[in-house]
């Protein structure tokens, strides 16, 4: 014999208690698949998440981050603080990139600037905590009497900075 | 596949104690520090614990020093965190997260991936 539930859409639940008829989600609930026996409570984006998508009978809500944060997990399960640029996200919060590295955008990590004298070349704008060294032509290129800046110190390792 | 699933949280008294577990599963558990890191409801992320892969280090956030104990029991794959005296404002939902070596400190995040959560209400 066939199951009468799985004659109920999506968005509606299989109602025991009614003979098995086919019942609306209640509000604030959705059933995303036909045949369910209960539907699911809709998810709701309180303090730092927001609602990027309203819940509906058949679709569970999504939220992501109010500004100043971005999502992290599965669905946006997390929301976390943004740093400003030329800072990095640590356990205890957002602190500057150390010397010699440098974060260009809110999220991630400080990273070494890059060595132009490994590319054979000289620094042509050096590198701030906000910006990477701009590598101009190599030092032989340049002529004579032109000034070259001094590479910059040995950058450490990320995930391995002092506080 | 890689899981994580916390449990033990709930609804608390202030002053009271609470012991969150979380279960790993799909990867070699002794190899990883752990972490715990919470969201309170207004609030981003915030930092709570981390212990390496051996136990033998752990690190704590200034605000739960002193209560928070956070350990780990390798041969069940098993991670915890004791808290004791219970404040209003560790009310948030708890996550359990795998960091991507066996050591650790209280400086960078190195999370690669997280539990679902367990939801603590401190509350009279």
């Known amino acids: 014999l066939q199951d009468p539930c799985s004659n109920c859409p999506a968005g509606t639940f299989c109602d025991n208690n009614r003979n098995q008829i086919c019942s609306p989600c209640p509000p604030n609930s959705f059933s995303s698949a036909g045949g369910q026996r209960t539907c699911d409570i809709c998810r709701q984006c309180k303090g730092v998440f927001r609602t990027r998508k309203e819940c509906s009978s058949t679709s569970n809500a999504e939220c992501d981050c109010t500004p100043g944060f971005h999502c992290l997990g599965a669905g946006c399960s997390m929301c976390e603080q943004d740093c400003k640029q030329g800072q990095e996200l640590t356990k205890k919060g957002c602190k500057d990139c150390c010397f010699g590295t440098f974060n260009d955008q809110k999220r991630g990590i400080c990273r070494p600037w890059t060595n132009c004298s490994l590319d054979g070349k000289s620094v042509l704008v050096n590198g701030t905590k906000e910006r990477d060294v701009v590598c101009g032509p190599s030092p032989a290129d340049l002529s004579p009497g032109a000034s070259s800046v001094t590479p910059p110190a040995p950058a450490r390792e990320p995930g391995h900075s002092p506080q | 596949e890689v899981q994580l699933l916390e449990s033990g949280g709930g609804l608390v008294q202030p002053g009271g104690s609470l012991r969150l577990s979380c279960t790993a599963s799909?990867?070699?558990?002794?190899?990883?520090?752990m972490s715990w890191v919470r969201q309170a409801p207004e609030k981003g992320l915030e930092w709570v614990s981390s212990i390496s892969g051996s136990g033998g280090s752990t690190f704590y956030a200034d605000s739960v020093k002193g209560r928070f104990t956070i350990s780990r029991d390798n041969s069940k794959n098993t991670l915890y965190l004791q808290m004791n005296s219970l404040r209003a404002e560790d009310t948030a939902v708890y996550f359990c997260a795998k960091e991507g070596s066996s050591e650790t400190d209280d400086h960078y995040y190195n999370v690669d991936v997280w539990g679902q959560g367990t939801t603590v209400t401190v509350s009279s």
């Open positions: 799909g990867f070699t558990f002794s190899n990883y520090a």
